[in-house]
């Protein structure tokens, strides 16, 4: 199976100035004893073996290399130098590889488990001998290091001065190219097929390619403005309509086939316009109004659809009252007209100012269009009056008025008087004759259900949770900010995220270090130290193992019989005494009179028998919540997340590289950062816009809904389009009502329902 990551060790120098083995013998010496004059030059054929295992406060060189092991070929003689890790060394090694050489000093140990961060490294230098399999005789040096390391490209330098040799090396842990997080157990491999269309960001989160969205980037982003209630898409940029819907954005219903003078709100309807009826709205219910069939003053009455009846005045008959009988008896001539009977009926001779078959029509002195400049002519008996537009005056509106005196321009740089009008030079973002209409810059730019807020000369997309960017085009993964601490795995959910914590951690962000010492797993009275996600048992001398449950042999070779305080019987047939070891490995025995003794302890030990390790943690030297582990005449600090250094007193800068978007300012915290966002932005990294659906997104009283991929306007009757700006009835096309007014059409006429603060026929 493929590894999740790699532990890499680059050996850069080894100095064995005397060319000897750990035993003191020469590398190539017969019988392997040191020669009087020292060992010769380059007698050692040095290679290195590496063992990687779980963290041990007290390193034991034996036992399995539980995390893996590796070895180099023979690297040189007694001493040698290799290119160090880092940029210069990488270039040198690249040149060597180009020449077909392997990188000799590099040991790569792959691992197929979540990297635990803490580890023990044992490095051994050996002398190569063709005739011998490796045994302790050929060991030049053994050094060890126990610590913590996180996956990163940077190398960490280690220097060791052993009994015989000095070693310099660099180590690092790197995740495999498809694995991420502090433990290399988050998988992400870019792909572009039906299982997902994504690349991977620096945290291993899926970053959808253009045109795709969703947790796995399998869902296509439809054409902007596509009404997802009645349409959708399986490939990006399309808008395929559900049965019964049509139009570019699938927001127009399909009317009943054959519908003539009707429309629909839902598919397959045929809702008739005024004065039309029948299943297909093809029956004229107002034949009288549309055809005026009755002549000679007959009264028209609508009957069945497409039918009518004429009620004729006295003296007239026929279907349309077209036949006259004794026409003048009923005095049909109005306004002083004189009646004369003629074969077809009667004729009226009208006085001045009147006309028509019954002198009922006032002669229209306005017929000659006497009013100039678009003035409205009002016909009067024997005359007319001109009602002039604001910019003209005079009896026939022939004189130019200076409209700028009335300061008509609202949001303008200036007003210019023109002949027959005026011109307002509008500030950007405003339009209309008086610069009174805010230009609606919202044209469906906001994706993923974002709500468009119209601003002056601009717009702002208010994105739903989980999306950001100027057009809500960026799918925001709540896991992108790596909120889970302690190597927790982040799972992005529709309404947030969930942290799956490693063993030893809990809390919503895995920020709570579970006290693994409660209850204590340590046996035989060992003290328990709680570490980050782990524990350590400080075993007494006579027990070992992770939980101090493995007994150690206190007196190898059997017990001794004390003769004097510091000696023991050497055994039968052997004269003299041997050291009893009563002061243990950490003390020197001094005989006192009368067979007594006292122990002079090595540095770091105390007690009658020098068996007690002085607790170097008593002064609580570890800062910022670091866990102190007592060692021999020393201590080690295990630092909580966010702190490093020997005493856990160094706080690395989490603002490098800068995580804040949209000009947010970054403030470094402990194992965290805070972004102070500019106005209009929010979120951990200022990636999300602030505002929600407002009253201006949908026109004409439409209701705005978030609908996943785009906003949706539920339009009132008579309106359609993605923002309810397209009228269904012809009298409202194009919309005559300004300033947000709602147009209500009936047949060929319309009326405007104005917003508060506006009035007039068209809300001007």
């Amino acid at each position: 199976a493929r590894p999740m990551g790699y532990f890499e060790l680059q050996l850069s120098a080894l100095r064995n100035v005397n060319g000897e083995l750990l035993s003191g013998a020469c590398c190539d010496g017969d019988g392997r004893t040191t020669r009087a004059g020292g060992c010769g030059h380059d007698e050692c054929d040095t290679y290195v073996r590496v063992c990687l295992k779980e963290y041990q406060a007290k390193v034991t060189p034996t036992g399995p290399c539980s995390y893996g092991h590796g070895a180099t070929p023979v690297l040189g003689g007694n001493s040698f130098y290799l290119p160090p890790a880092g940029a210069a060394g990488d270039r040198a090694r690249a040149r060597a590889r180009a020449g077909g050489d392997q990188d000799p000093g590099l040991v790569v140990i792959p691992f197929q488990f979540a990297w635990p961060r803490s580890f023990t490294l044992i490095v051994e230098a050996w002398d190569w001998d063709n005739d011998t399999t490796p045994n302790e005789e050929l060991l030049i040096e053994r050094v060890s290091h126990a610590g913590m390391i996180n996956p990163e490209d940077r190398w960490k330098s280690l220097h060791f001065s052993g009994h015989v040799a000095h070693l310099e090396l660099q180590i690092r842990v790197r995740c495999d190219e498809n694995y991420y997080s502090a433990t290399c157990n988050k998988f992400c491999r870019p792909r572009n097929d039906f299982f997902g269309h994504y690349t991977c960001d620096q945290y291993g989160n899926k970053a959808c390619m253009d045109g795709w969205m969703g947790k796995e980037c399998k869902e296509a982003v439809c054409k902007q403005g596509c009404n997802l209630l009645h349409g959708g898409c399986t490939v990006p940029g399309e808008c395929r309509c559900s049965y019964g819907w049509q139009g570019r954005f699938c927001d127009e219903c399909v009317p009943y086939p054959g519908c003539v003078h009707g429309s629909c709100v839902e598919p397959w309807q045929c809702n008739c316009e005024t004065n039309w009826g029948g299943l297909l709205c093809d029956k004229d219910l107002n034949y009288c109004g549309s055809h005026h069939p009755c002549t000679n003053g007959g009264t028209c009455i609508n009957a069945e659809p497409d039918q009518y009846r004429c009620t004729c005045p006295d003296g007239y008959s026929g279907r349309n009252c077209e036949k006259a009988e004794h026409a003048c008896t009923s005095n049909p001539c109005a306004n002083g007209g004189s009646c004369h009977e003629v074969p077809s009926g009667f004729e009226c001779h009208c006085p001045s100012g009147w006309s028509g078959p019954t002198c009922a029509l006032d002669i229209d002195e306005c017929a000659s269009n006497p009013c100039a400049a678009g003035g409205t002519c009002v016909d009067q008996v024997d005359g007319f009056e001109c009602i002039c537009p604001e910019q003209w005056v005079g009896a026939t509106c022939q004189l130019d008025a200076n409209e700028c005196e009335g300061k008509p321009c609202l949001n303008a740089f200036s007003c210019k008087n023109l002949i027959g009008g005026y011109y307002c030079d509008c500030i950007p973002g405003w339009k209309g004759i008086n610069c009174h209409i805010n230009v609606n810059d919202c044209r469906g730019q906001c994706q993923h259900g974002g709500t468009c807020k119209d601003l002056v000369n601009g717009y702002q997309c208010v994105c739903p949770r989980g999306f950001g960017g100027r057009h809500c085009e960026l799918e925001r993964d709540e896991c992108a900010s790596s909120p889970c601490h302690s190597g927790g795995l982040c799972e992005d959910l529709a309404d947030g995220f969930h942290c799956h914590c490693p063993q030893g951690f809990s809390g919503p962000l895995c920020e709570v270090d579970v006290d693994l010492c409660e209850p204590s797993p340590c046996r035989n009275g060992a003290r328990c130290y709680n570490l980050e996600g782990d524990y350590y048992c400080a075993c007494p001398d006579d027990f070992g193992g992770k939980n101090c449950s493995v007994p150690r042999e206190p007196c190898p070779g059997g017990a001794c019989r004390v003769i004097d305080g510091c000696g023991s019987d050497a055994g039968p047939g052997m004269p003299g005494t041997a050291a009893s070891g009563v002061c243990g490995p950490h003390g020197r025995c001094v005989s006192q009179p009368g067979g007594n003794f006292s122990c002079i302890c090595d540095s770091g030990f105390t007690g009658t028998y020098c068996h007690e390790n002085i607790d170097d943690c008593l002064g609580q030297p570890c800062r910022n919540g670091g866990t102190c582990i007592d060692e021999v005449d020393a201590f080690r600090c295990f630092c909580p997340s966010g702190w490093e250094g020997e005493l856990c007193d160094t706080n690395p800068n989490d603002c490098l590289p800068d995580p804040c978007h949209s000009r947010g300012r970054c403030y470094d915290l402990v194992n965290d950062f805070y972004c102070a966002c500019d106005d209009g932005w929010k979120g951990k990294t200022c990636h999300s816009r602030e505002f929600q659906c407002d009253a201006y997104t949908c026109s004409n009283g439409g209701t705005c809904y978030d609908s996943g991929d785009t906003f949706r306007c539920a339009c009132p009757p008579g309106w359609k389009g993605s923002t309810c700006a397209v009228a269904k009835n012809s009298s409202c096309l194009p919309n005559p009502c300004v300033n947000g007014g709602t147009c209500v059409g009936s047949g060929a006429s319309f009326s405007c329902i104005c917003r508060d603060g506006w009035e007039g026929r068209t809300c001007t």
């Epitope: 493929r2 572009n192 039906f194």
Partner: antibody
């Protein structure tokens, strides 16, 4: 040598369950997707579903959603198809197939297939 | 779901003939189309992936072309072992779908 071997097919009554296995060898199991494709007698190929063993992502055809479950055991290099509530129309030869993928090419195709195992749903 | 329509559903040809099979997608599938050959009682074999790339080990007489909605599999000179059923498959969007197959028979 790359090999995929299906097993677990047989006769089952309508409404019953069956579990198919696909044992993989000769390649890095977590570097590929494993898909199940079926072929009814005398008919064409129909995709059933698939899994990405590295992260456990799965996807299913609408016709089997809610009834079939695909899983993978990376320690055994084996993928499984658990079939519940079986119907007569699920009768087919079931193949498991390996699918490589790469961000640089759109759709890489299923390059290795097993020999197939017959599932018969009948009372 | 995207429909993949193959034509013809069957054809008769002689050894040495040039054979062309077409596949039309109901929507744009970029170049995410693969072609398979299947013989009776056997599992399908991959011939072409990403519309035009010849899979390793497949004879060079097989070639593929197309993008968007129209795709073609061409056998430049039909050999006796090429008599089989051929399927196209799109893998651009879920669920992946196969064509109904084209059976190539001996004339």
């Amino acid at each position: 040598e790359v090999q995929l071997v299906e097993s677990g097919g047989g006769l089952v009554q309508p409404g019953g369950s069956l579990r198919l296995s696909c044992a993989a060898s000769g390649f890095t199991f977590t570097s590929y997707d494993i898909h199940w494709v079926r072929q009814a007698p005398g008919k064409g190929l129909e995709w059933v579903g698939g899994i990405s063993p590295a992260d456990g992502d799965t996807d299913y055809a609408n016709s089997v959603k809610g009834r079939f479950t695909i899983s993978a055991d990376t320690s055994k290099n084996t993928a499984y198809l658990q079939m519940n509530s079986l119907r007569a129309e699920d009768t087919a030869v079931y193949y498991c197939a390996r699918n490589d993928y790469d961000v640089r090419s759109v759709g890489s195709g299923m390059d290795y297939w097993g020999q197939g195992t017959l599932v018969t749903v009948s009372s | 779901d995207i429909q993949m329509t193959q034509s013809p559903s069957s054809l008769s040809a002689s050894v040495g003939d040039r054979v062309t099979i077409t596949c039309r997608a109901s929507q744009d599938v970029s170049t995410a189309v693969a072609w398979y050959q299947q013989k009776p009682g056997k599992a399908p074999k991959l011939l072409i992936y990403s519309a035009s790339f010849l899979y390793s080990g497949v004879p060079s007489r097989f070639s593929g072309s197309g993008s968007g909605t129209d795709f073609t599999l061409t056998i430049s000179s039909l050999q006796p072992e090429d008599f089989a059923t051929y399927y196209c498959q799109q893998s651009y969007t879920t669920p992946p779908t196969f064509g109904q197959g084209t059976k190539v028979e001996i004339k």
